[in-house]
């Protein structure tokens, strides 16, 4: 899986979308998890409604919401009041039994609020060094790694 980078502004909301094949994943609940390092386990943050037919209902865990358009094949995650500690590697998952298929790997980056000068030195501004080398910018809020490219491994 390539990793898609989504950039959000501190204090604002960030929407992450994960497209999938609606037929292949028919009847499956979805989940959003935070990965503890590139090779680490993925800790569940929030999952869609227990009843698949009600997956369109938004479910919250703290400041993170999930909703699933099962016909259109798009899982949407909302991170409200984005903070620096929300930065990291995540996965959109399709659940079946005790197994989980990865729909998309996502790197969340937190940008500085251009109107907030108090902590301007604490957050990343576009134009400075990025987490990925030669990353292809698709949109202002997301980009994908080139084929075969991996996120910089390690620090803890």
């Amino acid at each position: 899986h390539n990793t898609t980078v989504f950039q959000g502004v501190a204090g604002q909301s960030l929407q992450v979308s994960c497209p999938y094949d609606s037929m292949k994943h028919w009847g499956r609940r979805k989940a959003w998890c935070r990965q503890l390092g590139e090779k680490g386990p993925c800790q569940r943050v929030v999952s869609t409604h227990n009843l698949w037919l009600l997956s369109f209902l938004r479910r919250w865990n703290g400041s993170t919401a999930i909703t699933d358009d099962t016909l259109g094949g798009t899982l949407t995650i909302t991170l409200r009041n984005l903070q620096p500690h929300d930065a990291g590697l995540y996965q959109c998952q399709s659940l079946h039994g005790s197994e989980a298929d990865t729909l998309r790997k996502v790197l969340v980056e937190v940008l500085a609020d251009p109107l907030d000068h108090r902590d301007a030195g604490d957050l990343w501004f576009p134009g400075e060094s990025e987490s990925f080398e030669d990353a292809h910018v698709e949109h202002s809020i997301s980009r994908s790694l080139l084929e075969g490219e991996i996120p910089f491994p390690p620090t803890s």
Epitope: Q35, G37, E38, G40, H85, L89, L123, I150, P154, T155
Partner: antibody
Framework: QVQLVQSGAEVKKPGASVKVSCKAS????????IHWVRQAPGQGLEWMGW????????KYAPKFQGRVTITADTSTSTAYMELSSLRSEDTAVYYC?????????????WGQGTLVTVSS | DIQMTQSPSSLSASVGDRVTITCHAS??????LSWYQQKPGKAPKLLIY???NLHTGVPSRFSGSGSGTDFTLTISSLQPEDFATYYC?????????FGQGTKVEIK
């Protein structure tokens, strides 16, 4: 018990090469990135490079590029660091270090260190 | 390369003291900073990852804070076993780089 065990101390002459091994036990090295970090006597820590044993991908610090080679043998769960064209400034303790990569790894294991002395 | 600058380079403190070590990155590194403790003749030990997360088994008197370019390691009440050298390390980009270290000595 999870641990990384490194090979013993080495004494080398300037211009020679040294190959240090790092054997993992209690876990599979394919599930980790293996880094090499060195520390000259009385000095700080210096990151040299890493390998992903799962696919053999490696990356080196520019300072060591062309002089260091990091490899891994998954069948023996062992990683290796070879440093060539040794000079006296390469005298240091060399550590191997395993983690799950960037972005919040909670796993962190270190070898006991291998002292490499370069002296004529 | 991203330069990591620690201060102070050394400090003397007594058991029970509150100790603060700072680490400054030459570029933005978000929260991708770790703190290590090293004792003479031993390998480093991870204390804090992702700027503020306490590693398993690390006493709660250790805490980390910061994001972007400025980070802090705090020991709320120094214990005899805490006398050691502390290093910060950035994990935003390669090569990973360490601070020069802060040696915490007994006053």
């Amino acid at each position: 018990q999870v641990q990384l065990v490194q090979s013993g101390a080495e004494v080398k002459k300037p211009g020679a090469s040294v190959k240090v091994s790092c054997k993992a036990s209690g876990f599979s090295i394919e599930d980790f990135y293996i880094h090499w970090v060195r520390q000259a006597p009385g000095q700080g820590l210096e990151w040299m490079g890493w390998i992903d044993p799962e696919n053999g991908d490696s990356k080196y610090a520019p300072k060591f590029q062309g002089r260091v080679t990091i490899t891994a043998d998954t069948s023996t769960s062992t990683a290796y660091m070879e440093l060539s064209s040794l000079r006296s400034e390469d005298t240091a303790v060399y550590y191997c270090h395993a983690d799950h990569g960037n972005y919040g790894s909670t796993m962190d294991y270190w070898g006991q260190g291998t002292l490499v002395t370069v002296s004529s | 390369d991203i330069q990591m600058t620690q201060s102070p380079s050394s400090l003397s403190a007594s058991v029970g003291d509150r100790v603060t070590i700072t680490c400054h990155a030459s570029q933005h590194i978000n929260v991708w900073l770790s703190w290590y403790q090293q004792k003479p003749g031993k390998a480093p030990k991870l204390l804090i990852y992702k700027a503020s997360n306490l590693h398993t088994g690390v006493p709660s008197r250790f805490s980390g804070s910061g994001s972007g370019t400025d980070f802090t390691l705090t020991i709320s009440s120094l214990q005899p076993e805490d006398f050691a050298t502390y290093y910060c390390q950035q994990g935003q980009t390669y090569p990973r780089t360490f601070g020069q270290g802060t040696k915490v000595e007994i006053k």
